[in-house]
Interface confidence: low
């Protein structure tokens, strides 16, 4: 339904607080380098303008699109060219090209300082002194570092952030109360950001059809009692929401997400029996809860899939009449019967089925041709099952840190051209699959592990896209969204790689390592491990283990020494020499 003033419509729907928060997120995700104060000023100006349009929708400029209004506002930033270089050229374009231009300049790895957490008392004072500014700062800092963060969900995180400070700043032991909550929000936030990044990559790189297929599979697993028509409606609405958020249309996205939550709760009887608790919550919690809700129980006595999709003589007729609808029904029926499969496996099965029908429906005897199509699924199902079994065994044997190290070595040998920080970050996250998923029973392992790996490998893909250094990474990332993980799993050692020259500086460590947290110390050691593999890609596991054990002992010894710096200098030289000898460098 058309509105005379889009900005007034969204302001009224969302309310002033959410409107301001979402505009701040939008601006921070576009202009990631701009100071907080500049963004607040822009947001206040937009908000004042929106209020004039609420008062009179016919007022000057109130009929302009949100992209036009927001783009014009962003283009008033005085230092645009100095700070953003060529991004300033976006301002010479007209909508919709201007917005597309801004989107293309979003940086997944912006040059921003690491967020350092101040002392608890300092934070509590800042929170009490100016709660509004404190919370805006949170939105700004997260949004600029995560330019694809799902904006309505970030509002939910901010609400929890506020609740944590409200509760803990009054507690007897503020730190004991607050720090675990902030750690949890940080970890959940990173996971949420990465999951949304995959959704946006799916839409932007592989198109709406790919995203809809993913959504059909996931919603069918989650709501197996819902009719196909109901799942299709939810998929259409969900696709609209994510298309908007990934496109920077955050006000529309948040508004449509609220409408979708309302619809789901009004129709929960025909969707899922698991929604009752979610639907009793306030809006932000409700939407989050629905997105995370557990799978409903499968209906009893579901008939065999073969009857409709293999044995029926009408398979080719049905397929020809409406290909995507028929394939959607296949995916729906298969997914609702298999909550134990990953979404990407279900999509591989659907792709195999589609390829078979394309070939067989043009054959002399179609039925004879596709009769054994389900037999082709067996190896596709067994491959992730076996991989997860092997890797969970390895994880249980090694523990998380050493399992990460095994993956670091594995992936550095596969794609040694990738920068060391990226290899460390991605391999550490890949390694977290163990503690996240291996504890689950067999029936939940694959959806947990393989769909999580899809999220992590997408991080590698988006970082690599900015700096393409490996044809193998480009190939695995771009050929097929659902086959990314099997593609990376299948990569062997890159025999074409010319080992990096040895640089002693890379392996020089100082006393500052002693004051690092355990996590940061691990990252230092893992960075050294990647560099070792880049210098000596043919090093055996045993050689690398020996060097890393020596390195751990060296750090432990020097951190206990009276003169730490001298110890690091002298023992470090010996360690480098011993490592070179051990690895034949």
């Amino acid at each position: 339904d058309a509105h005379k003033s889009e900005v007034a419509h969204r302001f009224k729907d969302l309310g002033e607080e959410n409107f301001k928060a979402l505009v701040l997120i939008a601006f921070a995700q576009y202009l990631q380098q701009c100071p907080f104060e500049d963004h607040v000023k822009l947001v206040n100006e937009v908000t004042e303008f929106a209020k004039t349009c609420v008062a009179d929708e016919s007022a000057e400029n109130c009929d302009k699109s949100l992209h036009t209004l927001f783009g014009d506002k962003l283009c008033t930033v005085a230092t645009l060219r100095e700070t953003y270089g060529e991004m300033a050229d976006c301002c010479a374009k007209q909508e919709p090209e201007r917005n597309e231009c801004f989107l293309q300049h979003k940086d997944d790895n912006p040059n921003l300082p690491r967020l350092v957490r101040p002392e608890v008392d300092v934070m509590c004072t800042a929170f009490h002194d100016n709660e509004e500014t404190f919370l805006k700062k949170y939105l700004y800092e997260i949004a600029r570092r995560h330019p694809y963060f799902y904006a309505p969900e970030l509002l939910f995180f901010a609400k929890r952030y506020k609740a944590a400070f409200t509760e803990c700043c009054q507690a007897a032991d503020k730190a004991a109360c607050l720090l675990p909550k902030l750690d949890e929000l940080r970890d959940e936030g990173k996971a949420s950001s990465a999951k949304q990044r995959l959704k946006c990559a799916s839409l932007q790189k592989f198109g709406e059809r790919a995203f809809k297929a993913w959504a059909v599979a996931r919603l069918s697993q989650r709501f197996p009692k819902a009719e196909f028509a109901e799942v299709s409606k939810l998929v259409t609405d969900l696709t609209k929401v994510h298309t908007e958020c990934c496109h920077g249309d955050l006000l529309e996205c948040a508004d449509d997400r609220a409408d979708l939550a309302k619809y789901i709760c009004e129709n929960q009887d025909s969707i899922s029996s698991k929604l009752k608790e979610c639907c009793e919550k306030p809006l932000l919690e409700k939407s989050h809860c629905i997105a995370e809700v557990e799978n409903d129980e499968m209906p009893a006595d579901l008939p065999s899939l073969a009857a409709d999709f293999v044995e029926s003589k009408d398979v080719c007729k049905n397929y020809a009449e409406a290909k995507d609808v028929f394939l959607g029904m296949f995916l729906y029926e298969y997914a609702r019967r298999h909550p134990d499969y990953s979404v990407v496996l279900l999509l591989r099965l659907a792709k195999t089925y589609e390829t078979t029908l394309e070939k067989c429906c043009a054959a002399a005897d179609p039925h004879e041709c596709y009769a054994k199509v389900f037999d082709e699924f067996k190896p596709l199902v067994e491959e992730p099952q076996n991989l997860i079994k092997q890797n969970c065994e390895l994880f249980e044997q090694l523990g998380e840190y050493k399992f990460q190290n095994a993956l670091l070595v594995r992936y550095t040998k596969k794609v040694p051209q990738v920068s060391t920080p990226t290899l460390v970050e991605v391999s550490r996250n890949l390694g977290k699959v163990g503690s996240k998923c291996c504890k689950h029973p067999e029936a939940k392992r694959m959806p947990c592990a393989e769909d999580y790996l899809s999220v992590v490998l997408n991080q590698l893909c988006v970082l690599h896209e900015k700096t393409p250094v490996s044809d193998r990474v480009t190939k695995c990332c771009t050929e097929s969204l659902v086959n990314r993980r099997p593609c990376f799993s299948a990569l062997e050692v890159d025999e074409t790689y010319v080992p990096k020259e040895f640089n002693a500086e890379t392996f020089t460590f100082h006393a500052d390592i002693c004051t690092l947290s355990e996590k940061e110390r691990q990252i230092k050691k893992q960075t050294a491990l990647v560099e070792l593999v880049k210098h000596k890609p043919k090093a055996t596991k045993e050689q690398l283990k020996a060097v890393m054990d020596d390195f751990a002992a060296f750090v432990e010894k020097c951190c206990k020494a009276d003169d730490k710096e001298t110890c690091f200098a002298e023992e470090g030289k010996k360690l480098v020499a011993a490592s070179q000898a051990a690895l034949g460098l």
Partner: nanobody
């Protein structure tokens, strides 16, 4: 810490070509925004061309657009400036500068670059 070492400068006739190189050590060049600046006698440092960290988006000063090309070879950890159709007003000491942390953009502001080479002299004269 990033060390930068320029080479390739020299004397060239108007209309001629030169290729400047800037070898980086201490950090991968693909992880930094890098740029060429120049300083003519008695003038301030002027931005010539830049390339983003983590993405090959290039930027040029209007005065060199269409004549100069900036590129980098990640495997050699080296930045290049191919200069064609050189003019006498291109005479200057050319510096390469780096801004680590994978900034997508390069800035034309010299003071945002913490690392600089020692410079290489380019003279365009008949």
């Amino acid at each position: 810490e990033v060390q930068l070492l320029e080479s390739g400068g020299g004397l060239v006739q108007p209309g001629g070509s030169l290729r400047l190189s800037c070898a980086a050590s201490g950090r991968y060049i693909d992880e930094t925004a890098v740029a060429w600046f120049r300083q003519a006698p008695g003038k301030g440092r002027e931005f010539v061309a830049g390339i983003g960290g983590g993405v090959d988006i290039t930027y040029y000063a209007d005065s060199v657009k269409g004549r100069f090309t900036i590129s980098r070879d990640n495997s050699k950890n080296t930045l290049y400036l191919q200069m064609n159709s050189l003019r006498p007003e291109d005479t200057a000491v050319y510096y390469c500068a780096a801004r680590p942390g994978r900034p997508l953009i390069t800035s034309k502001q010299a003071d945002l670059y913490p690392y600089w080479g020692q410079g290489t002299l380019v003279t365009v004269s008949s």
